[in-house]
Interface confidence: medium
Amino acid sequence: KFSKQSWGLENEALIVRCPRQGKSSYIVDWYYSQTNKSIPTQERNRVFASGQLLKFLPAEVADSGIYTCIVRSPTFNRTGYANVTIYKKQPDCNVPDYLMYSTVSGSEKNSKIYCPTIDLYNWTAPLEWFKNCQALQGSRYKAHKSFLVIDNVMTDDAGDYTCKFIHNENGANYSVTATRSFTVKDEQGFSLFPVIRAPAHNETKEVEIGENTNLTCSACFGKGAQFLATVQWQLNGNKITDFSEPRIQQEEGQNQSFSNGLACVNTVLRIADVKEEDLLLRYDCLALNLHGLRRHTIRLSRKHHHHHH
């Protein structure tokens, strides 16, 4: 409960906000959840707490884990959890689903793409913007404050947009990138019974005990903007929110991508520190629209190590 997913790339800055709301004057204590060890507030540390914010300057893959914040007001103590995953830099241009922020839709009249999480950082304009890893050039693109505006939006403008900026902390600069999909609303759309692209039905995924793993639920629903199109994970037939295990989280927001003109939605189930009992669970990817519901099941199994003599 009160757990928020945050992710970033190694060697970039990552700033995470405690998911409990309160006043800036409240005292906030941060801990490593596993060890209950307090996180220092001194800025000379690479990872330090600063009120409601937890700062990784820069982040390392080993920082991944669950962090506890306790917000102490004069009347209550409130506990929250930040589930942090730091990934290795991708060697190629492809941005995997688990690094994507929520999708935004645009039309000819409104084509603003906000840079996700930027409000947490101390940055100065201008932002750099990339589409499918190519720097955006031309008068159609205007970087304005924390968002990008595209003039005369066309269907070709759909794709993955990355903003890049510099966070400054006490004179030191750290790079930050964030990517989200942009979809263009198409008037001539239609909807179909959901088609689940991943996982395959009754698939089994091999995992290492103690490692993190991600399961992607991806389905297509038709062409163009969809009135209702949702994908979600269930555990043993129960909603993720009813399953009180902070290690297992469904990402906030759903990424919408267009594959061959089809409207497809993804959501990632993140499982931190895989345990034996996770192998006993049934993981259901549910895709729902006005036509109905489709379900694909996936199970986890322990990775077999082949010993060579």
Epitope: F2, Q21, G22, K23, Y26, S73, P74, T75, F76, K239
Partner: antibody, heavy 117, light 106 residues
Framework: EVQLVQSGAEVKKPGATVKISCKVS????????MHWVQQAPGKGLEWMGR????????EYAEKFQGRVTITADTSTDTAYMELSSLRSEDTAVYYC??????????WGQGTLVTVSS | DIQMTQSPSSLSASVGDRVTITCITN??????IHWYQQKPGKVPKLLIY???TLRPGVPSRFSGSGSGTDFTLTISSLQPEDVATYYC????????FGQGTKLEIK
């Protein structure tokens, strides 16, 4: 001991405006949120809104939006709730209560407002 | 807006009885549910916050449970001084009180 002392009962005519005060003692009003709650005679509790007195940020329940104004004077540790365009159904006891963003911990004694022509 | 359905609206029980009051929300909320007691002619008093955390000074016969959309306040052994109206409050999105449950002694 935290204490919240509210102003006295009021009788108002329909269409008028009422302003209730809530003075906090043994507590700095800036340190937490101040909420206001309505309770009509024989009825349940209804949250009206809250203020962060340190910065003046307010949020109001949809039902009262446009008619209620919550303010705070940090120099006197006093919060105020003003309700305009009064009608007979606004006859109620109004409570101030201090707490965090999510809930109320300490309550004032209540102020009865009677709206009658 | 989040709607709260509190039940029952009133109930009568004997001293020593186990009493449960339920609040159901129309949407999944985190455990941002709190329980208040209001004795006749008195101001409301916070009993339980965040689903199941007892406020200091509140007798241990009071407990809270539930998650998602269904929440329960339980009085394990009803005492005469528990005669009051009980309200749940959600604060997942703004704040909304339940309609209240008036508890009387048989």
């Amino acid at each position: 001991e935290v204490q919240l002392v509210q102003s006295g009962a009021e009788v108002k005519k329909p269409g008028a405006t009422v302003k209730i005060s809530c003075k906090v003692s043994a507590f700095n009003i800036k340190d937490d949120y101040m909420h206001w709650v309505q309770q009509a005679p024989g009825k349940g509790l209804e949250w009206m809104g809250r203020i962060d007195p340190a910065i003046g940020n307010t949020e109001y329940a949809e039902k009262f939006q446009g008619r209620v104004t919550i303010t705070a004077d940090t120099s006197t540790d006093t919060a105020y709730m003003e309700l305009s365009s009064l009608r007979s159904e606004d006859t109620a006891v109004y409570y101030c209560a201090t707490g965090d963003f999510y809930a109320m911990a300490y309550w004032g004694q209540g102020t009865l407002v009677t709206v009658s022509s | 807006d989040i709607q709260m359905t509190q039940s029952p609206s009133s109930l009568s029980a004997s001293v020593g009885d186990r009493v449960t009051i339920t609040c159901i929300t129309n949407t999944d909320i985190d455990d941002v549910i709190h329980w208040y007691q209001q004795k006749p002619g008195k101001v409301p008093k916070l009993l339980i916050y965040e689903g199941n955390t007892l406020r200091p000074g509140v007798p241990s016969r009071f407990s809270g449970s539930g998650s998602g959309t269904d929440f329960t306040l339980t009085i394990s052994s009803l005492q005469p001084e528990d005669v009051a109206t009980y309200y749940c409050l959600q604060s997942d999105n703004m704040l909304t009180f339940g309609q209240g449950t008036k508890l009387e002694i048989k």
